[in-house]
């Protein structure tokens, strides 16, 4: 996978009326690093890595960067004709790459209302808008925004992508994305009976780097795909991941089941807990995909924030 | 590629027990289940049990219980079964098997002949 | 214990002709638990189709599965000498595990 820097802004208008401030999180290899103080109006470390390697410069450098950038995108919400009444959000996410070959990317993509409406590749200035006649609207309304606006030239796309760059580079040496190998906490857990069946969960935590096996087993034979339910690799805030696995049994037969896990050139195999005791104590867990930080306003406003 | 090489036949008497051993290669022995299988001289085949090397877990046919031990060596990727109490009933070859994790007996050994005669 | 009765127990069969074996489970398994293998006299069994209908590695593609529920079947596109043998049936839907009383496949 290749280094990646990415950054997530919005900015909110409620009755055509553009929220002051703006809401922002960094992610760095797909771990969140960074989140904006709304408050304080200051980008802040996220999750106790971010805080011991980088230090109080980065974070003034990037509360200027995104501070700036946060005004351009309320600027840009102010000049989309079609707001109705009520809330709504423009979104930018900024991202760039370095891969393994030392080639690089860059690019940024808006949403309006949660609907993607344009994307720009950042090296070669192209422009991408889907079929939708309101994305096609939203994009030329913001083109022609930043047409009469003397900031968004060509120069000021490539100086965008090779300060992204130069962050990503600056951030990787300091050893935030250090390549390490944290091998995954596994626990199986069962919930309650229902019609002499009972759904299996195994669940993988703290674990580094992201890519990771996760299945279930029958008599070592792994189950068909459509009998098992998978959760989504997600970001634990501590620069490690989680995700699960589940699937349905039949009671009685939990001896004949194992959770098999492979993780960087790691593997194991993980019983179900058998008896009673251990399928009732287990609480009933719903499996949803929670979207990470940023959830008061989010919960308060409802707002669909996009990864 | 993968491998399993059994030990060679056993010739026993009457009451006595035997040690099968079927040493694994060509894969992370642990990563997949031995399973063992009895075939009697003429006859079909009959699952005996299997176990999870990563951590010693066995899964055996109620036949068996009693008859039939299975146990790990990690260290040597070796697994082993263990039959006591032999009678002429269980003259047989049997087998060791392992799979790729899509189908039960992908690999299978070469046989051991356990022979109970007096 | 769930029990596979196999059909024909012994046949014969000419080169290049179509053959067919049936298993009959004595109650219904998933498609994903039956399984056939091949064992040539003096040799080990050898994977022939899991899962009802997938080729394991390296099995000609004159050999095909099929079936449902209850009944299941082995087909031989076109009879070769080299594939005389005995061939089983194996479920592994409940354990214990079993196998099919094996069907002995001759050249004629």
């Known amino acids: 996978e290749p280094h990646s820097l990415r950054y997530n802004l919005m900015v909110l208008s409620q009755d055509g009326s553009v929220q002051s401030g703006f809401l922002a999180e960094g992610h760095l290899d797909g771990q969140p690093f960074l989140r904006y103080d709304r408050q304080k109006r200051r980008a802040k470390p996220q999750g106790q890595w971010a805080e011991d390697v980088l230090g109080a410069k980065t974070w003034d450098t990037e509360t200027e960067d995104l501070t700036e950038n946060g005004q351009d995108l309320r600027r840009t919400l102010t000049h989309i004709k079609d707001q109705k009444g009520g809330l709504h959000s423009l979104q930018e996410i900024r991202v760039c790459e370095i891969h393994e070959d030392s080639s690089t990317r860059g690019s940024r993509h808006f949403y309006y209302d949660g609907e993607l409406f344009l994307s720009q590749n950042l090296e070669t200035q192209e422009s991408t808008v889907p079929q939708s006649s309101r994305a096609q609207t939203l994009a030329m309304n913001v083109t022609n925004f930043w047409k009469e606006d003397a900031m968004k030239t060509k120069t000021h796309y490539r100086a965008m992508q090779a300060d992204c760059l130069q962050k990503l580079q600056r951030y990787l040496k300091s050893g935030v994305a250090i390549r390490r190998t944290v091998p995954p906490m596994v626990n199986v857990t069962c919930s309650e009976v229902s019609e002499g069946n009972i759904t299996v969960t195994c669940r993988a935590s703290s674990f580094y780097p992201r890519n990771i096996t996760l299945t279930w087993r029958q008599d070592g034979v792994s189950l068909s795909h459509n009998t098992q339910q998978w959760g989504d690799v997600l970001p634990d805030g501590n620069g490690t991941y989680q995700t699960w696995v589940a699937t349905r049994i039949r009671q009685g037969e939990e001896q004949r089941f194992t959770c098999y896990m492979e993780h960087s050139g790691n593997h194991g195999t993980h019983p179900v807990p058998s008896g009673k005791a251990l399928v009732l104590q287990s609480q009933r867990t719903d499996h949803h995909h929670h979207h990470h930080g940023l959830n008061d306003i989010f919960e308060a406003q409802k707002i669909e924030w996009h990864e | 590629q993968v491998q399993l090489k059994q030990s060679g036949p056993e010739l026993v008497k009457p009451g006595a027990s035997v040690k099968v051993s079927c040493k694994a290669s060509?894969?992370?022995?642990?990563?997949?289940?031995i399973y063992w299988v009895k075939q009697s001289h003429g006859k079909s085949l009959e699952w005996i049990g299997y176990?999870?090397?990563?951590?010693?877990?066995?899964v055996q046919n109620q036949k068996f219980k009693g008859k039939a031990t299975l146990t790990v060596d990690k260290s040597s990727s070796t697994a082993y079964m263990h039959l006591n109490s032999l009678t002429s009933e269980d003259s047989a070859v049997y087998y060791c098997a392992t799979t790729d994790g899509y189908s039960l007996f992908t690999y299978w050994g070469q046989g051991t002949l356990v022979t109970v005669s007096s | 214990d769930i029990v596979l009765t196999q059909s024909p127990t012994t046949m014969a069969a000419s080169p290049g002709e179509k053959i067919t074996i049936t298993c009959s489970a004595s109650?219904?398994?998933?498609?994903?638990?039956l399984h056939w293998y091949q064992q040539k006299p003096g040799f080990s069994p050898k994977l022939l189709i899991y899962r009802t209908s997938n080729l394991a590695s390296g099995v000609p593609a004159r050999f095909s599965g099929s079936g449902s529920g209850t009944s299941y079947s082995l087909t031989i596109g076109t009879m070769e000498a080299e594939d005389v043998a005995t061939y089983y049936c194996?479920?592994?839907?409940?354990?214990?595990?079993?196998f099919g009383s094996g069907t002995k496949l001759e050249i004629k």
């Open positions: 194996q479920q592994g839907s409940s354990i214990p595990f079993t």
């Open positions: 109650s219904s398994i998933s498609s994903n638990y």
């Open positions: 060509g894969y992370a022995f642990t990563k997949y289940n």
């Open positions: 176990i999870d090397p990563y951590n010693g877990g066995t």
